[in-house]
Protein backbone atom coordinates (compact mmCIF):
# COMPACT_ATOMS: atom_id res chain seq x y z
CA UNK A 1 0.00 0.00 0.00
CA UNK A 2 1.21 3.25 -0.23
CA UNK A 3 0.04 6.83 -0.46
CA UNK A 4 -3.34 7.42 -2.02
CA UNK A 5 -3.51 7.49 -6.13
CA UNK A 6 0.18 6.17 -6.53
CA UNK A 7 1.44 3.46 -7.83
CA UNK A 8 4.73 1.55 -7.32
CA UNK A 9 6.78 1.03 -10.28
CA UNK A 10 6.43 -2.35 -11.97
CA UNK A 11 8.52 -4.06 -15.07
CA UNK A 12 11.78 -2.66 -14.08
CA UNK A 13 14.26 -3.55 -17.21
CA UNK A 14 17.95 -3.23 -17.62
CA UNK A 15 18.15 -1.92 -20.86
CA UNK A 16 22.70 -2.47 -21.67
CA UNK A 17 24.25 -2.67 -25.12
CA UNK A 18 28.40 -1.68 -24.59
CA UNK A 19 27.97 -0.55 -20.93
CA UNK A 20 25.62 2.25 -22.22
CA UNK A 21 22.46 1.02 -19.26
CA UNK A 22 19.16 2.86 -19.03
CA UNK A 23 16.95 1.34 -16.07
CA UNK A 24 13.31 1.61 -17.78
CA UNK A 25 9.90 0.64 -15.88
CA UNK A 26 5.95 1.28 -16.15
CA UNK A 27 3.74 3.06 -15.74
CA UNK A 28 3.84 6.41 -17.61
CA UNK A 29 2.98 8.62 -14.16
CA UNK A 30 -0.11 10.18 -13.85
CA UNK A 31 0.04 12.40 -10.86
CA UNK A 32 3.26 11.16 -9.58
CA UNK A 33 6.96 11.03 -10.40
CA UNK A 34 9.84 8.59 -9.57
CA UNK A 35 13.25 9.00 -8.58
CA UNK A 36 15.91 5.75 -8.81
CA UNK A 37 18.60 4.79 -6.46
CA UNK A 38 21.45 2.31 -7.53
CA UNK A 39 24.33 0.66 -5.55
CA UNK A 40 25.62 -2.45 -5.38
CA UNK A 41 25.06 -5.14 -3.01
CA UNK A 42 27.95 -3.79 -0.76
CA UNK A 43 27.44 -0.23 -1.12
CA UNK A 44 25.33 2.51 0.09
CA UNK A 45 22.56 3.73 -2.15
CA UNK A 46 22.97 6.72 -4.76
CA UNK A 47 19.98 8.55 -6.29
CA UNK A 48 19.65 9.50 -9.76
CA UNK A 49 16.89 11.14 -12.27
CA UNK A 50 14.71 12.63 -9.05
CA UNK A 51 11.18 13.46 -9.21
CA UNK A 52 11.12 12.60 -12.68
CA UNK A 53 8.01 12.19 -15.07
CA UNK A 54 10.33 9.51 -16.93
CA UNK A 55 10.20 6.02 -16.85
CA UNK A 56 14.00 5.63 -18.12
CA UNK A 57 16.88 6.65 -16.18
CA UNK A 58 20.39 6.35 -17.57
CA UNK A 59 22.44 4.60 -14.74
CA UNK A 60 25.84 4.38 -17.03
CA UNK A 61 27.77 6.90 -15.00
CA UNK A 62 27.17 4.60 -12.14
CA UNK A 63 27.47 1.46 -13.24
CA UNK A 64 31.31 2.12 -15.47
CA UNK A 65 32.62 3.11 -12.23
CA UNK A 66 33.37 -1.01 -11.61
CA UNK A 67 31.27 -3.18 -14.77
CA UNK A 68 32.45 -6.66 -13.06
CA UNK A 69 30.13 -5.63 -9.50
CA UNK A 70 26.39 -6.42 -9.59
CA UNK A 71 24.31 -3.76 -9.34
CA UNK A 72 20.80 -3.55 -7.67
CA UNK A 73 18.46 0.05 -8.05
CA UNK A 74 14.99 0.90 -6.90
CA UNK A 75 12.00 3.00 -8.13
CA UNK A 76 11.17 5.35 -5.79
CA UNK A 77 7.06 6.50 -6.55
CA UNK A 78 6.12 10.11 -4.97
CA UNK A 79 2.51 11.94 -5.22
CA UNK A 80 3.45 15.05 -7.89
CA UNK A 81 3.66 18.04 -5.72
CA UNK A 82 4.10 16.67 -2.72
CA UNK A 83 6.97 14.35 -3.03
CA UNK A 84 7.64 14.70 0.91
CA UNK A 85 4.68 12.48 0.88
CA UNK A 86 5.68 8.55 2.64
CA UNK A 87 3.37 5.40 2.20
CA UNK A 88 1.25 3.85 5.24
CA UNK A 89 4.36 2.28 6.47
CA UNK A 90 6.69 5.60 6.61
CA UNK A 91 8.62 5.44 3.29
CA UNK A 92 7.93 5.67 0.05
CA UNK A 93 6.15 3.30 -2.37
CA UNK A 94 9.58 1.49 -4.34
CA UNK A 95 10.04 -1.67 -6.29
CA UNK A 96 13.25 -3.39 -6.64
CA UNK A 97 14.99 -4.25 -9.92
CA UNK A 98 16.30 -7.73 -11.31
CA UNK A 99 20.05 -7.64 -10.02
CA UNK A 100 22.31 -6.86 -13.09
CA UNK A 101 26.24 -7.67 -13.45
CA UNK A 102 27.54 -5.60 -16.79
CA UNK A 103 30.40 -7.08 -17.47
CA UNK A 104 28.39 -10.58 -17.82
CA UNK A 105 25.01 -9.25 -19.12
CA UNK A 106 25.08 -5.65 -21.31
CA UNK A 107 24.42 -6.53 -24.68
CA UNK A 108 27.46 -6.54 -27.73
CA UNK A 109 26.66 -3.81 -29.96
CA UNK A 110 26.51 -4.39 -33.78
CA UNK A 111 30.14 -4.65 -34.55
CA UNK A 112 31.59 -2.29 -37.73
CA UNK A 113 33.85 -3.55 -40.31
CA UNK A 114 36.92 -1.23 -40.53
CA UNK A 115 38.69 -2.18 -43.13
CA UNK A 116 39.69 -4.83 -45.50
CA UNK A 117 42.92 -5.30 -47.74
CA UNK A 118 44.13 -7.41 -50.11
CA UNK A 119 47.66 -8.78 -50.76
CA UNK A 120 47.77 -11.29 -53.67
CA UNK A 121 46.07 -14.27 -51.85
CA UNK A 122 45.16 -12.98 -48.39
CA UNK A 123 42.48 -10.93 -47.36
CA UNK A 124 43.58 -8.54 -44.02
CA UNK A 125 39.72 -7.91 -42.49
CA UNK A 126 40.48 -5.34 -39.59
CA UNK A 127 36.75 -5.11 -36.39
CA UNK A 128 36.38 -1.54 -35.80
CA UNK A 129 37.63 -1.53 -31.59
CA UNK A 130 34.28 0.21 -30.46
CA UNK A 131 34.82 2.92 -27.82
CA UNK A 132 32.50 2.10 -24.42
CA UNK A 133 31.95 5.10 -21.57
CA UNK A 134 33.64 3.09 -19.36
CA UNK A 135 36.98 4.82 -18.07
CA UNK A 136 40.27 4.12 -16.78
CA UNK A 137 42.93 7.16 -16.14
CA UNK A 138 40.67 9.75 -17.52
CA UNK A 139 40.51 7.92 -20.96
CA UNK A 140 37.71 5.91 -22.34
CA UNK A 141 38.18 1.97 -22.95
CA UNK A 142 37.55 0.24 -25.99
CA UNK A 143 35.47 -3.06 -26.07
CA UNK A 144 38.59 -5.23 -26.73
CA UNK A 145 40.12 -3.00 -23.08
CA UNK A 146 37.60 -4.11 -21.30
CA UNK A 147 37.06 -7.75 -22.41
CA UNK A 148 40.17 -8.84 -23.28
CA UNK A 149 40.64 -12.34 -24.39
CA UNK A 150 37.19 -12.81 -23.43
CA UNK A 151 35.76 -11.31 -26.78
CA UNK A 152 36.41 -13.14 -30.08
CA UNK A 153 35.30 -12.17 -33.53
CA UNK A 154 33.95 -14.50 -35.82
CA UNK A 155 34.33 -13.81 -39.55
CA UNK A 156 31.66 -15.11 -41.86
CA UNK A 157 32.62 -14.42 -46.13
CA UNK A 158 31.68 -15.77 -49.14
CA UNK A 159 32.55 -14.98 -52.66
CA UNK A 160 29.83 -12.53 -54.33
CA UNK A 161 29.23 -14.98 -57.48
CA UNK A 162 28.55 -17.73 -55.03
CA UNK A 163 26.41 -18.83 -51.66
CA UNK A 164 28.86 -21.30 -50.06
CA UNK A 165 30.21 -19.38 -46.76
CA UNK A 166 33.27 -19.93 -45.01
CA UNK A 167 34.08 -18.82 -41.04
CA UNK A 168 36.80 -17.62 -38.93
CA UNK A 169 37.67 -16.92 -35.74
CA UNK A 170 40.11 -14.17 -33.61
CA UNK A 171 40.83 -13.08 -30.47
CA UNK A 172 42.07 -10.20 -31.75
CA UNK A 173 40.40 -7.65 -33.93
CA UNK A 174 41.95 -8.79 -37.38
CA UNK A 175 41.52 -11.42 -39.45
CA UNK A 176 44.10 -12.98 -42.26
CA UNK A 177 42.11 -14.62 -44.65
CA UNK A 178 42.99 -17.06 -47.76
CA UNK A 179 41.01 -16.10 -50.78
CA UNK A 180 41.13 -16.86 -54.46
CA UNK A 181 43.23 -14.41 -56.85
CA UNK A 182 40.49 -12.43 -58.96
CA UNK A 183 37.59 -13.37 -57.02
CA UNK A 184 35.44 -10.63 -54.92
CA UNK A 185 34.30 -11.23 -51.47
CA UNK A 186 31.88 -10.55 -48.85
CA UNK A 187 32.29 -10.24 -45.37
CA UNK A 188 30.05 -9.93 -42.16
CA UNK A 189 31.16 -10.08 -38.59
CA UNK A 190 29.45 -10.70 -35.21
CA UNK A 191 31.01 -10.26 -31.48
CA UNK A 192 31.06 -13.04 -28.92
CA UNK A 193 32.10 -13.69 -25.37
CA UNK A 194 32.08 -17.54 -25.08
CA UNK A 195 32.68 -17.71 -21.29
CA UNK A 196 29.06 -16.36 -21.25
CA UNK A 197 25.59 -17.78 -20.61
CA UNK A 198 23.25 -15.05 -22.27
CA UNK A 199 23.87 -12.48 -24.20
CA UNK A 200 26.24 -14.34 -25.67
CA UNK A 201 26.26 -13.04 -29.16
CA UNK A 202 25.77 -9.27 -31.26
CA UNK A 203 24.43 -8.99 -33.97
CA UNK A 204 26.06 -9.73 -37.68
CA UNK A 205 27.95 -6.44 -38.50
CA UNK A 206 26.72 -4.91 -42.24
CA UNK A 207 27.53 -7.01 -44.96
CA UNK A 208 30.84 -5.41 -46.72
CA UNK A 209 32.04 -6.53 -49.77
CA UNK A 210 35.28 -6.21 -52.14
CA UNK A 211 35.11 -4.15 -55.54
CA UNK A 212 32.58 -2.07 -54.17
CA UNK A 213 32.56 2.17 -54.17
CA UNK A 214 33.79 1.83 -50.43
CA UNK A 215 37.21 -0.06 -51.99
CA UNK A 216 39.52 -2.40 -50.25
CA UNK A 217 40.74 -0.14 -47.40
CA UNK A 218 38.15 2.20 -45.48
CA UNK A 219 39.31 4.49 -42.53
CA UNK B 1 21.09 -28.80 -18.34
CA UNK B 2 22.02 -29.31 -22.43
CA UNK B 3 21.33 -31.70 -23.90
CA UNK B 4 21.05 -32.55 -28.00
CA UNK B 5 18.89 -35.46 -28.48
CA UNK B 6 19.18 -36.84 -32.27
CA UNK B 7 16.59 -39.07 -34.09
CA UNK B 8 17.10 -42.46 -34.58
CA UNK B 9 18.86 -44.58 -36.98
CA UNK B 10 18.01 -44.22 -40.31
CA UNK B 11 18.59 -47.24 -43.20
CA UNK B 12 18.44 -45.63 -46.52
CA UNK B 13 19.32 -46.59 -50.27
CA UNK B 14 21.93 -45.34 -52.41
CA UNK B 15 21.56 -42.28 -54.42
CA UNK B 16 18.23 -41.37 -51.92
CA UNK B 17 18.84 -38.49 -49.48
CA UNK B 18 18.25 -38.79 -45.50
CA UNK B 19 17.49 -35.68 -43.06
CA UNK B 20 18.52 -36.04 -39.46
CA UNK B 21 17.20 -34.31 -36.67
CA UNK B 22 18.84 -33.07 -33.80
CA UNK B 23 16.71 -31.04 -30.37
CA UNK B 24 18.44 -28.94 -28.16
CA UNK B 25 17.28 -28.07 -24.83
CA UNK B 26 18.89 -26.32 -21.11
CA UNK B 27 19.85 -23.59 -23.50
CA UNK B 28 18.57 -20.87 -26.84
CA UNK B 29 20.32 -22.54 -30.14
CA UNK B 30 20.33 -18.55 -31.20
CA UNK B 31 23.44 -18.03 -28.53
CA UNK B 32 25.36 -20.38 -29.95
CA UNK B 33 26.90 -22.40 -33.42
CA UNK B 34 25.55 -25.94 -33.80
CA UNK B 35 27.48 -28.17 -36.27
CA UNK B 36 27.56 -31.91 -37.60
CA UNK B 37 30.09 -34.29 -37.44
CA UNK B 38 30.53 -37.82 -39.15
CA UNK B 39 32.30 -40.97 -38.09
CA UNK B 40 32.69 -44.39 -39.91
CA UNK B 41 32.91 -47.27 -38.53
CA UNK B 42 36.38 -48.19 -36.68
CA UNK B 43 37.58 -44.02 -37.85
CA UNK B 44 38.01 -40.82 -36.64
CA UNK B 45 36.09 -37.75 -36.52
CA UNK B 46 35.06 -35.31 -40.06
CA UNK B 47 33.51 -31.85 -39.91
CA UNK B 48 30.99 -31.83 -42.06
CA UNK B 49 29.43 -28.53 -41.40
CA UNK B 50 27.76 -25.88 -39.27
CA UNK B 51 24.84 -23.48 -38.39
CA UNK B 52 24.51 -20.36 -36.93
CA UNK B 53 20.69 -20.09 -35.88
CA UNK B 54 20.85 -16.56 -35.31
CA UNK B 55 21.55 -15.75 -38.51
CA UNK B 56 20.82 -18.77 -41.08
CA UNK B 57 24.53 -18.78 -41.96
CA UNK B 58 25.99 -22.20 -43.15
CA UNK B 59 29.19 -22.89 -43.74
CA UNK B 60 30.00 -26.62 -45.11
CA UNK B 61 33.17 -29.12 -45.47
CA UNK B 62 33.94 -28.72 -49.35
CA UNK B 63 33.81 -32.68 -49.39
CA UNK B 64 30.03 -32.17 -48.69
CA UNK B 65 29.23 -28.96 -50.47
CA UNK B 66 26.61 -29.46 -52.72
CA UNK B 67 25.62 -32.93 -51.06
CA UNK B 68 24.45 -31.76 -47.35
CA UNK B 69 22.18 -29.00 -46.12
CA UNK B 70 22.13 -27.70 -42.76
CA UNK B 71 19.12 -25.83 -41.27
CA UNK B 72 18.44 -24.63 -38.14
CA UNK B 73 14.08 -24.22 -36.27
CA UNK B 74 14.78 -21.65 -33.49
CA UNK B 75 11.14 -21.69 -32.75
CA UNK B 76 11.60 -25.80 -31.66
CA UNK B 77 15.73 -25.54 -30.79
CA UNK B 78 15.57 -28.06 -33.38
CA UNK B 79 19.22 -28.45 -35.67
CA UNK B 80 18.52 -30.02 -39.29
CA UNK B 81 20.89 -32.19 -41.56
CA UNK B 82 20.31 -33.83 -45.04
CA UNK B 83 22.45 -36.15 -46.92
CA UNK B 84 21.74 -36.45 -50.17
CA UNK B 85 22.99 -38.52 -53.70
CA UNK B 86 24.02 -41.26 -50.72
CA UNK B 87 26.60 -43.79 -51.12
CA UNK B 88 27.92 -46.54 -49.24
CA UNK B 89 31.08 -44.07 -47.87
CA UNK B 90 28.18 -42.74 -46.22
CA UNK B 91 27.64 -45.14 -43.99
CA UNK B 92 28.21 -43.78 -40.21
CA UNK B 93 27.45 -42.21 -37.09
CA UNK B 94 26.73 -38.64 -37.62
CA UNK B 95 26.65 -36.13 -33.85
CA UNK B 96 25.20 -32.85 -33.40
CA UNK B 97 27.46 -30.68 -31.14
CA UNK B 98 26.92 -27.40 -29.79
CA UNK B 99 30.17 -24.81 -30.42
CA UNK B 100 30.24 -22.35 -27.70
CA UNK B 101 33.10 -20.18 -29.47
CA UNK B 102 35.80 -21.55 -27.76
CA UNK B 103 35.06 -26.00 -28.37
CA UNK B 104 32.14 -27.72 -29.65
CA UNK B 105 31.62 -28.34 -25.70
CA UNK B 106 28.50 -30.76 -25.99
CA UNK B 107 27.54 -33.54 -28.18
CA UNK B 108 24.61 -35.72 -29.09
CA UNK B 109 24.01 -39.23 -28.64
CA UNK B 110 24.80 -39.68 -32.61
CA UNK B 111 22.57 -41.19 -35.23
CA UNK B 112 23.43 -44.56 -37.07
CA UNK B 113 22.79 -43.85 -40.90
CA UNK B 114 23.51 -46.49 -42.90
CA UNK B 115 23.65 -46.71 -46.66
CA UNK B 116 22.46 -49.91 -48.64
CA UNK B 117 21.07 -51.48 -51.61
CA UNK C 1 42.37 -25.75 -45.30
CA UNK C 2 43.84 -26.34 -42.11
CA UNK C 3 45.59 -29.84 -41.56
CA UNK C 4 46.25 -31.23 -37.88
CA UNK C 5 48.57 -33.61 -37.65
CA UNK C 6 47.92 -35.76 -34.32
CA UNK C 7 50.92 -37.80 -32.31
CA UNK C 8 51.30 -40.62 -31.86
CA UNK C 9 48.31 -42.68 -33.14
CA UNK C 10 48.85 -44.51 -30.37
CA UNK C 11 50.48 -45.66 -27.36
CA UNK C 12 50.79 -47.76 -24.30
CA UNK C 13 51.02 -46.37 -20.78
CA UNK C 14 50.95 -47.59 -17.35
CA UNK C 15 48.85 -46.95 -14.46
CA UNK C 16 50.10 -43.49 -12.59
CA UNK C 17 52.26 -42.55 -15.77
CA UNK C 18 52.07 -38.97 -17.42
CA UNK C 19 51.64 -39.41 -21.33
CA UNK C 20 51.67 -36.04 -23.80
CA UNK C 21 50.17 -35.91 -26.85
CA UNK C 22 50.61 -33.44 -29.38
CA UNK C 23 48.99 -31.52 -31.95
CA UNK C 24 50.62 -29.60 -35.00
CA UNK C 25 48.35 -27.45 -37.20
CA UNK C 26 49.69 -26.30 -40.70
CA UNK C 27 49.40 -22.61 -39.58
CA UNK C 28 48.43 -19.90 -36.40
CA UNK C 29 45.09 -21.01 -35.24
CA UNK C 30 45.35 -18.50 -32.25
CA UNK C 31 43.93 -21.35 -29.58
CA UNK C 32 40.98 -22.38 -31.29
CA UNK C 33 42.11 -25.58 -30.18
CA UNK C 34 39.99 -28.29 -28.27
CA UNK C 35 40.52 -31.78 -26.90
CA UNK C 36 37.95 -34.56 -26.74
CA UNK C 37 38.16 -38.02 -25.28
CA UNK C 38 35.91 -40.72 -27.17
CA UNK C 39 35.31 -44.53 -25.92
CA UNK C 40 33.78 -47.12 -27.80
CA UNK C 41 30.36 -46.54 -28.78
CA UNK C 42 30.22 -43.38 -26.72
CA UNK C 43 29.78 -39.62 -28.21
CA UNK C 44 32.88 -37.37 -27.85
CA UNK C 45 33.48 -35.44 -24.20
CA UNK C 46 34.62 -32.22 -24.21
CA UNK C 47 38.27 -32.33 -22.09
CA UNK C 48 40.22 -28.89 -22.71
CA UNK C 49 38.90 -26.01 -24.58
CA UNK C 50 40.91 -22.74 -25.80
CA UNK C 51 43.60 -24.69 -26.00
CA UNK C 52 44.02 -24.47 -22.00
CA UNK C 53 40.71 -24.72 -20.41
CA UNK C 54 39.66 -27.56 -18.29
CA UNK C 55 36.24 -28.27 -19.38
CA UNK C 56 33.55 -28.77 -16.38
CA UNK C 57 33.90 -31.97 -14.51
CA UNK C 58 37.36 -32.74 -15.96
CA UNK C 59 39.79 -33.83 -13.68
CA UNK C 60 42.92 -31.88 -13.47
CA UNK C 61 45.14 -34.86 -14.16
CA UNK C 62 44.40 -33.44 -17.51
CA UNK C 63 45.57 -30.47 -18.82
CA UNK C 64 46.19 -28.62 -21.94
CA UNK C 65 49.25 -26.02 -23.27
CA UNK C 66 49.97 -24.77 -26.64
CA UNK C 67 49.65 -21.49 -29.01
CA UNK C 68 50.23 -20.49 -32.39
CA UNK C 69 50.61 -24.30 -34.53
CA UNK C 70 51.78 -26.43 -31.61
CA UNK C 71 49.24 -27.99 -28.99
CA UNK C 72 50.06 -30.47 -26.13
CA UNK C 73 47.10 -33.04 -24.12
CA UNK C 74 48.74 -34.30 -20.84
CA UNK C 75 47.28 -36.65 -18.84
CA UNK C 76 49.10 -37.27 -15.07
CA UNK C 77 49.09 -40.32 -13.42
CA UNK C 78 47.30 -42.18 -15.55
CA UNK C 79 44.22 -44.30 -14.79
CA UNK C 80 42.32 -47.25 -16.17
CA UNK C 81 39.33 -45.40 -17.02
CA UNK C 82 42.08 -43.26 -19.03
CA UNK C 83 41.98 -45.72 -22.17
CA UNK C 84 40.16 -44.18 -25.58
CA UNK C 85 41.09 -42.46 -28.21
CA UNK C 86 41.50 -38.51 -28.04
CA UNK C 87 41.29 -35.87 -30.42
CA UNK C 88 42.05 -32.58 -31.41
CA UNK C 89 40.13 -30.23 -33.27
CA UNK C 90 40.70 -26.71 -34.47
CA UNK C 91 37.78 -24.45 -34.96
CA UNK C 92 39.87 -21.00 -35.97
CA UNK C 93 38.85 -21.45 -39.73
CA UNK C 94 36.39 -23.21 -41.81
CA UNK C 95 36.43 -26.09 -43.19
CA UNK C 96 37.33 -27.28 -38.82
CA UNK C 97 39.71 -29.91 -38.77
CA UNK C 98 40.26 -33.22 -36.69
CA UNK C 99 43.41 -34.64 -36.08
CA UNK C 100 43.63 -38.18 -36.78
CA UNK C 101 43.43 -39.53 -33.10
CA UNK C 102 45.29 -41.17 -30.11
CA UNK C 103 44.52 -44.47 -29.64
CA UNK C 104 45.56 -44.65 -25.76
CA UNK C 105 45.54 -48.08 -23.85
CA UNK C 106 47.06 -48.65 -20.54
CA UNK C 107 49.61 -51.89 -19.69
Known amino acids: SGTTNTVAAYNLTWKSTNFKTILEWEPKPVNQVYTVQISTKSGDWKSKCFYTTDTECDLTDEIVKDVKQTYLARVFSYPAGNVESTGSAGEPLYENSPEFTPYLETNLGQPTIQSFEQVGTKVNVTVEDERTLVRRNNTFLSLRDVFGKDLIYTLYYWKSSSSGKKTAKTNTNEFLIDVDKGENYCFSVQAVIPSRTVNRKSTDSPVECMGQEKGEFRE | QVQLLESGAVLARPGTSVKISCKASGFNIKDYYMHWVKQRPGQGLEWIGG????????MYDPKFQGRVTITADTSTSTVFMELSSLRSEDTAVYYCARDSGYAMDYWGQGTLVTVSS | DIKMTQSPSSMYASLGERVTITCKAS??????LSWYQQKPWKSPKTLIY???SLADGVPSRFSGSGSGQDYSLTINNLESDDTATYYCLQHGESPYTFGGGTKLEIK
Open chain 3, 27 to 32: QDIKSF
Open chain 2, 51 to 58: NDPANGHS
Open chain 3, 50 to 52: YAT
